[in-house]
């Protein structure tokens, strides 16, 4: 392990943190939990405690940002630099910044929470098997109502566990319509819309009317983000896959690697690639926010990079489902803060 010059560290043990903003890649509750679990790794082996607060005078301010984001260290777009953190100290020192040009996940693909179905709100499992085919995004296959769904296990055919994916046909968010689903088509400024739109807004948020005529009823909601089918790169970055789509005369109802030599999954963002040529890459496995946060929080606590490849503080991202902390990480953080105190022994009680 290595520490920063002068063994920079916090001189109090009750560390506070503030989550200043969020990535849209994950539900807020999942982000909150990822950060809490990342801090818990370090508190489990030291006398440190971590308390979430809601003000900027927190010791560790957590922020998602892209490119130039308010410090002297701009991010670099997708991949490359995933995040950075400042060593302990006042002000920006100790803060942790995450590059929101990354796809943040829990390391195993986009996290799509489900509603209804029979899986108690479990997240989608990508890819999943349905009727012998592999799906890497929510699908409407097998349904006549157009509602996108997913399996919450690897194989729907054997496990029969599913839920409905976020969809404007199921519900909307915020707005003034109590979460009612979109009504398609709807009229807005005299024009007919059969999909969510950003028209009339400067913030880029997709919305829809929840009645047939917005001009008359003024009822609307925001359309849920579809992380599973929001494309990256190609010529339609940020747009949604359209399923089914036609490619070389064949219909596809999930992302495909057909036509590519590198195996990367892609989709069309209109119903016909052959005529429109609009496409993008489907989401990849993403980076585990939990693992990257745990690494960054190590820096925010005073640990430099480790030369041990298996250590959490090694400077290369590596997805693991095992215990993230290596003995080298534990030795490093204990060098700065000491071990977690043993609970006071209790005298035996007599009855």
């Amino acid at each position: 392990f290595q520490t920063f010059e002068g063994d920079l560290k916090w001189h109090h043990h009750n560390i506070t943190y503030w989550i200043q903003n969020y990535s849209e890649d994950l539900p807020r509750a999942v982000i909150d939990d990822a950060f809490a679990r990342a801090f818990a790794l370090w508190s489990a082996v030291t006398p440190l405690t971590f308390t979430r607060v809601y003000s900027r005078d927190a010791d560790i301010v957590i922020q998602f940002g892209v490119a130039e984001h308010g410090d002297g260290y701009p991010f670099d777009g997708k991949d490359g630099l995933l995040a950075h953190a400042f060593p302990p100290g006042p002000g920006i020192q100790g803060d942790a910044h995450f590059d929101d040009d990354e796809l943040w996940s829990l390391g195993k693909g986009v996290v799509v929470p489900t509603r209804f179905g029979n899986a108690d709100g479990a997240a989608c499992h990508f890819p999943f098997i349905f009727e012998g085919r592999s799906y890497s995004a929510c699908t409407t296959d097998g349904r006549s109502d157009g509602l996108p769904w997913c399996s919450t296990t690897a194989n729907y055919d054997t496990d029969d566990r599913f839920g409905f994916c976020p969809s404007e046909r199921l519900y909307t968010q915020d707005g003034n319509a109590d979460g009612k689903p979109c009504q398609f088509p709807f009229i807005f400024q005299g024009q007919s819309y059969s999909a969510c739109t950003t028209d009339g807004r400067s913030d880029g948020y997709r919305w829809c009317a929840t009645t047939a005529n917005y001009d008359r009823d003024k009822l609307f909601g925001f359309c849920p983000t579809r992380a599973d089918s929001t494309v990256m790169g190609g010529n339609s970055a940020g747009e949604l896959c359209v399923f089914p789509f036609t490619f070389l005369g064949k219909e596809y109802s999930t992302c495909t690697s057909e036509g590519r030599g590198d195996g990367r999954l892609w989709c069309a963002t209109t119903s016909n690639f052959d005529s429109d040529k609009k496409w993008g890459f489907c989401p990849d496995q993403g980076y585990s926010l939990f693992l990257v946060a745990a690494h960054e929080f190590g820096h925010a606590l005073g640990l430099d990079h480790s030369s041990v490849p298996e250590a959490l503080m090694y400077p290369m991202y590596r997805f693991t489902e095992g215990p993230p902390l290596h003995k080298d990480d534990v030795n490093g953080i204990r060098h700065l803060y000491g071990p977690r105190p043993e609970p006071e022994p209790r005298p035996p009680t007599t009855t």
Partner: antibody
Framework: EVQLLESGGGLVQPGGSLRLSCAAS???????DMWWVRQAPGKGLEWVS????????FYADSVKGRFTISRDNSKNTLYLQMNSLRAEDTAVYYC?????????????????WGQGTLVTVSS | EIVLTQSPATLSLSPGERATLSCRAS??????LAWYQQKPGQAPRLLIY???YRATGIPARFSGSGSGTDFTLTISSLEPEDFAVYYC?????????FGQGTRLEIK
């Protein structure tokens, strides 16, 4: 021993082009942010451009759209392609190495600099 | 863009004297400040980074202090080889910027 050696400077007419090179040795070039900094005759230092290990680039407003920074990690070499040169681009151009790398950040400074190469833009 | 103002522009002192150079930032830059020394015909040399840490091989007579907007480079007892131009540089906000320099000359 860390070394940075610039080359490619010279006299060029306004509107012309030059390509500067900086050969690096003595450190793991591919891991570090690399910078170009210039100094007009008798003046102070001015940053020009930086390139991250990932290839992401940033430029000073004064050169944006005219200069292109690049790197060849297999050759341990940093480049600066300068087009549409102006009289005010006349300077000694230095390449410099960031002292630190990676995702922990402090202002660590440029710990190694090349000897500089003079670019003169004049008709 | 953060402006760094160095003072004085020129400092005339004798060997053995103490030199105090100032660098003021137009807004807070925490401790993201470096100091460089440049002699005629040479490239700059890193003296101090993170406001107060001496770079490798820099003699102990050089020290840096300050945080926020006000920073100081101190040379406790001037040696003949210390007479040069000194620049401060910030990375508290993007883009990085340099001060205009302080010329330290022999009195």
């Amino acid at each position: 021993e860390v070394q940075l050696l610039e080359s490619g400077g010279g006299l060029v007419q306004p509107g012309g082009s030059l390509r500067l090179s900086c050969a690096a040795s003595g450190f793991t070039f591919s891991q570090y942010d690399m910078w170009w900094v210039r100094q007009a005759p008798g003046k102070g230092l001015e940053w020009v451009s930086v390139i991250y290990p990932s290839g992401t680039t940033f430029y000073a407003d004064s050169v944006k759209g005219r200069f292109t920074i690049s790197r060849d990690n297999s050759k341990n070499t940093l480049y600066l392609q300068m087009n549409s040169l102006r009289a005010e681009d006349t300077a000694v151009y230095y390449c410099a190495k960031d002292r630190a790398y990676g995702d922990y950040v402090g202002w660590n400074g440029f710990d190694y600099w090349g000897q500089g190469t003079l670019v003169t833009v004049s008709s | 863009e953060i402006v760094l103002t160095q003072s004085p522009a020129t400092l005339s002192l004798s060997p053995g004297e103490r030199a105090t150079l100032s660098c003021r930032a137009s807004q807070s830059i925490s401790s993201f400040l470096a100091w460089y020394q440049q002699k005629p015909g040479q490239a700059p040399r890193l003296l101090i980074y993170d406001a107060s840490y001496r770079a490798t091989g820099i003699p102990a007579r050089f020290s840096g202090s300050g945080s926020g907007t006000d920073f100081t480079l101190t040379i406790s007892s001037l040696e003949p080889e210390d007479f040069a131009v000194y620049y401060c540089q910030q990375r508290g906000n993007w883009p990085i910027t340099f001060g205009q320099g302080t010329r330290l000359e022999i009195k």
